[in-house]
């Protein structure tokens, strides 16, 4: 998982920002995003497609930002000053994994190797870029 | 055209193994998530098992769990079923399936776009 | 896991006439809900996703309609490339179901 670092001049190779087109991701606190994202989709449609998987746990409400930590993955907010997406910090993470992984495993589904929380930052810091949960998302 | 075609299917013993494979064409498979359903002999349709389009989020009926692994393969445009420690109650046609494409970010809980179905044996 | 009940198991009509297919889920599934046919030897196809959506080439004969927990295909002239067996699918959390199936015969 690629973290973004603090660039004023952003990567030249780094993709230009794209407003969040997915249902689940608007209203979040956030309107822009970069593809590919922290989890190897190439567009938003593909990101859609994947995210999807987790409406379930996203009506069960199992934890009140669980919407904005997937997004934080799967549509991860974009600035002009970073040239790598930007993802939700660790313990939003765990505490997500915490709350709902106990849903999944209702159904006999664990919580998804790829969101690892081991593999995002511990807190936003300038040299590893990240995100706390927001006020009202 | 856009189509799924299947291979891989055969007669295997008790305890055997096979790998199905379908290969997709006239579409790009790393957009879709996937299925596999089969049908036994005369019986209806039975969900199997699911993967994600990245490959990353994978789900399985209760009667395959811990058996079966389903995969993909994106830059060949395949996706795969493996199947191990086959039972007689695996005796089916084996279909792969696409997530409907809704042409947009809104997901329907359908598939539009079957394999022709292999069938797998499992008889001594 | 929700239990999707179809009836009938057997539904005889004559060319022309009216199918009226009935879908129940042991819970709701809100809309989600699909239908299919099929025929023998043959893959299903996609008729109806959403409850009440026909996906892309279906006839306009075919329509579907219900929420919750009862759900409708209804076949309003049958042709004779119509009888086959129906079958009703929902996805509730991760997990998918069809209904058993009812096939649709010549009277």
């Known amino acids: 998982l690629e973290i973004g670092r603090f660039d004023p001049e952003r990567g030249r190779g780094a993709a230009p920002c794209q407003a969040v087109e997915i249902p689940m991701c608007r209203g979040i606190g956030y309107n822009l995003t970069r593809m590919p994202n922290l989890l190897g989709h190439t567009s938003q449609g593909e990101a859609a497609a994947e995210l999807a998987e987790f409406a379930p746990l996203v009506q069960y409400g199992c934890h009140s930002h669980l919407r904005f930590f997937l997004c934080s993955l799967y549509a991860p907010m974009c600035t002009d000053q970073v040239s790598t997406p930007i993802p939700a910090c660790r313990p939003m993470c765990e505490q997500a994994r915490l709350r709902c992984a106990p849903i999944m495993e209702q159904f006999n589904f664990g919580w998804p190797d790829s969101l690892d929380c081991a593999r995002l930052p511990t807190r936003n810091d300038p040299h590893a870029l990240c995100m706390e949960a927001p006020e009202n998302a | 055209e856009v189509q799924l075609v299947q291979s891989g299917g055969g007669l295997v013993q008790p305890g055997g193994s096979l790998r199905l494979s379908c290969a997709a064409s006239?579409?790009?498979?790393?957009?879709?998530?996937m299925n596999w359903v089969r049908q036994a002999p005369g019986k209806g349709l039975e969900w199997v098992s699911r993967i994600s389009n990245s490959g990353s989020l994978v789900y399985y009926a209760d009667s395959v769990k811990g058996r079966f692994t389903i995969s993909r393969d994106n830059s060949k445009n395949t996706l795969y079923l493996q199947m191990n420690s086959l039972r007689a109650e695996d005796t089916a046609v084996y279909y792969c399936?696409?997530?409907?494409?809704?042409?947009?970010?809104?997901?329907?809980?359908?598939?539009?776009?079957w394999g022709q179905g292999t069938m797998v044996t499992v008889s001594s | 896991e929700i239990v999707l009940t179809q009836s009938p198991a057997t539904l005889s009509v004559s060319p022309g006439e009216r199918a009226t297919l009935s879908c129940r889920a042991s819970?709701?599934?809100?809309?989600?809900l699909a239908w299919y046919q099929q025929k023998p030897g043959q893959a299903p196809r996609l008729l109806i996703y959403?409850?009440?959506n026909r996906a892309t080439g279906i006839p306009a004969r075919f329509s579907g309609s219900g929420s919750g927990t009862e759900f409708t295909l209804t076949i309003s002239s049958l042709q004779s490339e119509d009888f086959a067996v129906y079958y009703c699918q929902q996805r509730n959390n991760w997990l998918y179901t069809f209904g058993q199936g009812t096939k649709v015969e010549i009277k």
């Open positions: 006239g579409f790009n498979l790393r957009r879709y998530n």
């Open positions: 959403d409850a009440s």
């Open positions: 819970q709701s599934v809100s809309s989600n």
């Open positions: 399936a696409r997530d409907a494409d809704s042409s947009g970010y809104y997901r329907y809980d359908a598939f539009d776009i």
